[in-house]
């Protein structure tokens, strides 16, 4: 499956919406850095197909997409380019959903991928407990949206690898 | 609100297969996945597997995977779960619940349904 | 697959009393991934704490969780009669999900 040029377009977007939705220095929230321990391992492209990356590059999505779509995420940030930075996810998931289905049909998740997507889902868990402990500061968004600024990158370059390889 | 709304109580025969559906309402359908627990009678819980409604993929419990069947309709906001090769000791409800993280991990259920197998 | 183990099977205590439920993991289980379920007869399981420590939302202050790696604790601080039911942990730290035997909290 190809993913339309669109798409990458696309992940441009989102991360220079989520680079504008900063309302506070990051400096300023220095004493809540946290690590979320993202994933890295399952981003680096090597070992797996395509198809599997592509099962977990959407998960990484959905679960962003999610995140920013909870009413204490619309508290924090500036509705007009949180809606605009939600499109750009939704639209990434309808394209990277229609390759899964493309790819490999509907079936079985292949056992590898399982832990992969269990990492990302992990991952997510971390941040929403982070948040939650924090309780959904401005300082604690302000580390999220940095740490979901990375992801993203990790997501979008690992896109890039994959349509080298075809 | 997240309304979870399973089918009805089955009655099956040794051998024969049940297909279970749970409609979801109050929220994005292909945001979250979905899962499926059982509870034979006056037993505990034990995950089957989910499936993900956005794509269709699916995750097993290896206990189940060569008789189960997870799939979904996006155009209802329905995922349905059939088991075949039925046996007695899948005499158990079946519940339906939604995945999600924090306080929303397996915070919405469906009613559950009935499933005997009997002779 | 982590084979949670909980104990007592069932415990008889009386309303005002303090209720300490027990959940052993075979193997060590991130207390961000372990969670306890209330249910009562022919309805579903109904979500208390999540993430060890974390009470769910609309559950009373009485509930509590605690522990980590393989040791896992629900106390209710003092029992009111609604709280006698079937308590689950569960762990969704690898697959398969697992979920405990259950604790019966009955009235004495």
């Known amino acids: 499956c190809d993913l339309p040029q669109t798409h990458s377009l696309g992940n441009r977007r989102a991360l220079i919406l989520l680079a504008q939705m900063g309302r506070i220095s990051h400096f300023s929230c220095l004493k809540d850095r946290h690590d979320f321990g993202f994933p890295e391992e399952e981003f680096d492209g090597h070992q797996f197909q395509k198809t599997q990356a592509i099962s977990v590059l959407h998960e990484m999505i959905q679960q962003t997409f999610n995140l920013f779509s909870t009413e204490d995420s619309s508290a924090a940030w500036e509705q007009s380019l949180l809606e605009k930075f939600s499109t750009e996810l939704y639209q990434q998931l309808n394209d990277l959903e229609a390759c899964v289905i493309q790819e490999v049909g509907v079936e079985e998740t292949p056992l590898m991928n399982v832990d992969s997507i269990l990492a990302v889902r992990k991952y997510f868990q971390r941040i929403t407990l982070y948040l939650t402990e924090k309780k959904y500061s401005p300082c604690a968004w302000e580390v999220v949206r940095a740490e979901i600024m990375r992801s993203l990158s990790f997501s979008t370059n690992l896109q890039k690898r994959l349509r080298r390889k075809d | 609100q997240v309304q979870l709304v399973q089918s009805g109580a089955e009655v099956k025969k040794p051998g024969a297969s049940v297909k279970v559906s749970c409609k979801a309402s109050?929220?994005?359908?292909?945001?979250?996945?979905m899962h499926w627990v059982r509870q034979a009678p006056g037993q505990g819980l034990e995950w089957m597997g989910e499936i993900n409604p956005s794509h269709g993929r699916t995750i097993y419990n290896e206990n189940f995977k060569s008789r189960v069947t997870m799939t979904r309709d996006t155009s209802t906001s329905t995922v349905y779960m059939e088991l075949s090769s039925l046996r007695s000791e899948d005499t158990a409800v079946y519940y339906c619940a939604r995945g999600g993280l924090g306080p929303a991990w397996f915070a919405y259920w469906g009613q559950g349904t009935l499933v005997t197998v009997s002779s | 697959e982590i084979v949670l183990t909980q104990s007592p099977a069932t415990l008889s205590l009386s309303p005002g009393e303090r209720a300490t439920l027990s959940c052993s993991a075979g193997s060590s289980v991130d207390s961000s991934y372990l969670y306890w379920y209330q249910q009562k007869p022919g309805q579903a399981p109904r979500l208390l704490i999540y993430?060890?420590?974390n009470l769910a939302s609309g559950i009373p202050a009485r509930f509590s969780g605690s522990g980590s790696g393989t040791d896992f604790t629900l106390t209710i601080s003092s029992l009111e009669p609604e709280d006698f039911a079937v308590y689950y942990c569960?762990?969704?730290?690898?697959?398969?999900?697992?979920f405990g035997q259950g604790t019966k909290l009955e009235i004495k």
């Open positions: 109050g929220y994005t359908f292909t945001n979250y996945w």
């Open positions: 569960h762990q969704w730290s690898s697959y398969p999900f697992t």
């Open positions: 993430s060890t420590s």
